[in-house]
């Protein structure tokens, strides 16, 4: 997260760290007791490493009573996701067992009504992604509150030049933005999951290149079918 600040510890009990061989790779969001939603591209970077999900964490390195690392029983990328595009960039990870819920571990309600978030609405994005262009990684969860940008502006030739589909949304990226390592993490508006950080190799913190998020409401049928 660029230009953000340290999150209040455990105030985002839905927040997950998707890890490969014990290292943070992507963000994720607990959407059901045994399921974490993330970004499909995250798996590409996992190679043949051991994928696990850390829940109940604020610090990645320090011991915390609520922290627990779960093995992944199965990984379900969206069937239409492709390596060369950010379309359908969603991934569902089934944990090896149901998560032990508590104040620091709790699923987040996700948006089922397929309508756009109104431009100007402020939404929260959190993650353990890089906090500087030099690539500095934080140990503790960071967050930033960003205004949603209208799709027409986001699709301008000077911005994302038509790449933003109806199944995506954008947020302002003027010095404050999601970035590398935040992919798969949640964009939360008024206590409801609205978007998932896409995992393209987008430049971060440049206002002409707004943050891109996959709209979960657009994938309600797929999410429900996998979780069923």
């Amino acid at each position: 997260i660029l230009g953000g600040r340290e999150a209040e510890a455990h105030a985002r009990p839905y927040m997950a760290s998707v890890q490969v061989n014990g290292e943070h790779l992507c963000g994720g969001v607990l959407v059901a007791e045994q399921w974490v939603l993330s970004a499909a591209h995250c798996l590409e970077d996992a190679a043949d490493g051991k994928v696990q999900v850390l829940l109940g964490a604020h610090s990645l390195s320090q011991p915390e009573p609520s922290k627990r690392l779960y093995d992944v029983l199965r990984a379900v990328p969206h069937p239409d996701s492709r390596p060369d595009t950010i379309d359908h960039d969603l991934l569902l990870l089934q944990l090896s067992e149901k998560a032990t819920l508590g104040p620091a571990v709790r699923p987040l309600p996700w948006q089922r009504v397929d309508r756009d978030v109104e431009p100007g609405t402020l939404c929260d994005v959190a993650g353990w992604g890089i906090v500087s262009h030099a690539g500095r990684r934080p140990d503790r969860l960071q967050h930033v509150l960003l205004p949603v940008l209208d799709r027409a502006t986001c699709n301008r030739r000077t911005h994302h030049d038509g790449a933003i589909t109806q199944r995506m949304m954008c947020a302002e990226s003027n010095r404050r933005d999601s970035c590398k390592g935040d992919s798969g993490g949640p964009l939360v508006c008024g206590g409801v999951l609205e978007g998932v950080v896409t995992s393209g190799s987008r430049v971060c913190g440049n206002r002409k290149k707004p943050g891109i998020y996959t709209r979960v409401a657009s994938y309600a049928a797929w999410i429900d079918s996998v979780l069923a």
Epitope: G3, R5, A7, A11, R12, V117, E118, P119, G120, T121, L122, C123, D124, A126, H143, L145, P147, E172, N174, R175, R176, V188, C189, G190, G191, V192, R207
Partner: antibody
């Protein structure tokens, strides 16, 4: 205790400009959006817009886009609003207010300045 | 722009009574709503955020409810310090418009 201290009342002539200030204390100025709100006597408040001191990003109500210019001075933790081409319609009390965070993604205007009265009269 | 319509515009009540103020949005605002109290010549004070949540320090006699386009603020057992004007404000898209207000007066 979080405080937003606004500058004093202003009496200005039609067509002139006025710059009002809002000095923040007891919190990290660059972490919170500062909003500006207009209120005419006996009427409900009107949201003018916000500025985020950490990036100087602004977002304005279209109605006030030409009228109000929002700026900040990080070094003094002060937000400013410049009102230009003033008319009698601009006579009002102007408030600055911090957008506070509650939990993970809830927010509202939690701390307000005392208000600055602007009177436009020849 | 989303319009916020408050009712009633004014209300004359006695200490100890219970009152409900309503706010109707011109479209669904998905609970992105706050309520404020304002005394004459003073700044607004936040009472409720996200339609139902009370910030620290707000007495529990205040409660917010509602969803979609219809929201209400209830004040149980009115105290003398509760008299003044009340406003709703939405945060769903911009501009973040306020309601026209409800003036609560002592009977």
């Amino acid at each position: 205790q979080v405080q937003l201290q606004q500058s004093g009342p202003e009496l200005v002539k039609p067509g002139a400009s006025v710059k009002i200030s809002c000095k923040a204390s007891a919190y990290t100025f660059t972490d919170y959006y500062i909003n500006w709100v207009k209120q005419r006597p006996g009427q409900g408040p009107e949201w003018i817009g916000w500025i985020f001191p950490g990036s100087n990003s602004t977002y304005s109500n279209e109605k006030f886009e030409v009228k109000a210019t929002l700026t900040v001075d990080e070094s003094s933790s002060t937000a400013y609003m410049l009102l230009s081409s003033l008319t009698s319609e601009d006579s009002a009390v102007y408030f600055c207010a911090r957008l506070g965070y509650f939990g993970s993604s809830y927010h509202a205007l939690d701390y307000w300045g005392q208000g600055t009265s602007v009177t436009v009269s020849s | 722009d989303i319009q916020m319509t408050q009712s009633p515009a004014s209300l004359s009540v006695s200490v100890g009574e219970t009152v409900t103020i309503t706010c109707r949005a011109s479209e669904n605002i998905y609970s992105h709503l706050a309520w404020f109290q304002q005394k004459q010549g003073k700044s607004p004070r936040l009472l409720v955020y996200s339609a139902t949540n009370l910030p620290d320090g707000v007495p529990s006699r205040f409660s917010g409810s509602g969803s979609g386009t219809q929201y209400s603020l209830k004040i149980n057992i009115l105290q003398s310090e509760d008299f003044g004007s009340y406003y709703c404000q939405h945060f769903w898209g911009t501009p973040w418009t306020f309601g026209g207000g409800t003036k609560l007066e002592i009977k």
